[in-house]
Amino acid sequence: EEELQVIQPEKSVSVTAGESATLNCTVTSLIPVGPIQWFRGAGPGRELIYNLKEGHFPRVTTVLDPTKRNNMDFSIHISNITPADAGTYYCVKFRKGSPDVELKSGAGTELSVRAKPSAPVVSGPTARATPEHTVSFTCESHGFSPRDITLKWFKNGNELSDFQTNVDPAGKSVSYSIRSTARVVLTRRDVHSQVICEVAHVTLQGDPLRGTANLSEAIRVPPTLEVFQRPMRAENQVNVTCQVRKFYPQRLLLTWLENGNVSQTETASTLTENKDGTYNWRSWLLVNTCAHRDGVVLTCQVEHDGQPAVSKSHALEVSAHQKEQCSDTTSGPVLAPTAPLGGSG
């Protein structure tokens, strides 16, 4: 009588998460009577996967009808595979008894589960930085298997090289995670820029997953200030304008000071947007030139995006002709009281 053999023909089987796996097992003899059981893993801690003798295993079915004794096929289907199902599965023949006696095990079939990585999530710095500074972006993706994965960074379509990537865990696992940090040097033109994290994996059939982040969330372009004056039709008035250029984001508070004293505060509105995504704004004052006694210094002070204020001063220039137009008795504030104190445009 030939010795019973338990044959598991495949050393390994690979399936994609969500699909079914077929694990094949045949025996060369039906003698002696006794059950076949499937286990994941070997040794005392092995996990019972299916017992043809008894039990309820909702995800496991036999390939052939187990009541047909002469088929000698004990192959099983496992449905809805997840990464947690990965491992080596053993088909084991027992002799009926109390307890059942293990007679022979198959060589085992390693089930590897191909699981797609999750959509990459890109997160940027918590605080904005200014051009010429370096900011870090982090990309994370989880739940993939096998471990081999490729991650690339792009800025506006150009591949970046300054990044560091880790895949965890380092050892064998049912699924893996990737985390990559890229360093990006900001420029003044980056308001409209985008960084892309691209993940390629065997499960994606050449169609990589992408996560994006906008540099507009990470950049602060500080404004440049320019203060100048222009004469008005009324000979005793001049327009003093503060031009605030090329700033981002929009949040901006402007204060006019007359010889160091606050005269007017405005919040930026009706901004004009530049092609590069930055903004311009201007604020102006109507100044009564007859009200001067000494030299008047007007200061435009700008607080941008909660940063320390920057300012630009302008010494009011009054021509001899304008001085002549003023009567000797005229006195009062520098800023024309009959006109709005300021304007913007």
Partner: antibody
């Protein structure tokens, strides 16, 4: 349809012989362990004999040496040769198929009556 | 030989009742225990194998449990066709042996 049909029962004198047959249909008899079970009138069930797929045979103590179980694959039939019959062997004899993995009884014949009496 | 002891030997119950029959083995039989139903003048019918698995076509009102030496058969809601004699059987080793039977009668 899976079916077992016994025949060969009857009245026999003590010390006499009888051969019971069981014709199987709907399955291959040689692929299963097969059994004979008996039941005396008004009594419980008693396992009598079995034959395994390899031809190995088993008997309950009271019939050892007197009964012989066998099968004929070509006829898909099971037999029980009963010799040296005693009054205590009087019973309905059932042919039973053993289940696939563990030999749990699954299919029963309708039974044939054996009466041992002078 | 392994002795199988059933209790009670007889049981009176009404339609709709839930009844439990117990079976004890004289030694550990793992879960190689079967239950059979027999009506007068008929061949036994296989109900349960490996202590708790229902044979094909057996209604789910029948359930079995136990392992080792102590086993039970439960019928959840008795119907007129369930009044019969029930036998347990060990089939872990030869000679296979049956319990003496439990006769379930209408009250």
């Amino acid at each position: 349809e899976v079916q077992l049909v016994e025949s060969g029962g009857g009245l026999v004198q003590p010390g006499g012989s009888l051969r019971l047959s069981c014709a199987a249909s709907g399955f291959t008899l040689s692929s299963y362990d097969m059994h004979w079970v008996r039941q005396a009138t008004g009594k419980g069930l008693e396992w009598v004999s079995a034959i395994g797929t390899a031809g190995d045979t088993y008997y309950t103590g009271s019939v050892k040496g007197r009964f012989t179980i066998s099968r004929e694959n070509a006829k898909n039939s099971l037999y029980l040769q009963m010799n040296s019959l005693r009054a205590g062997d009087t019973a309905v004899y059932y042919c039973v198929r053993g289940g696939v993995w563990d030999d749990a009884f699954d299919i029963w014949g309708q039974g044939t009556m054996v009466t041992v009496s002078s | 030989d392994i002795q199988m002891t059933q209790s009670p030997s007889s049981l009176s119950a009404s339609v709709g009742d839930r009844v439990t029959i117990t079976c004890r083995a004289s030694q550990d039989i793992n879960n190689y225990l079967a239950w059979f139903q027999q009506k007068p003048g008929k061949a036994p019918k296989s109900l349960i194998y490996t202590a708790s698995s229902l044979h094909s076509g057996v209604p789910s009102k029948f359930s079995g449990s136990g392992s080792g030496t102590d086993f039970t058969l439960t019928i959840s809601s008795l119907q007129p066709e369930d009044f019969a004699t029930y036998y347990c059987q060990q089939y872990v080793s030869y000679p296979y042996t049956f319990g003496q039977g439990t006769k379930l009668e209408i009250k």
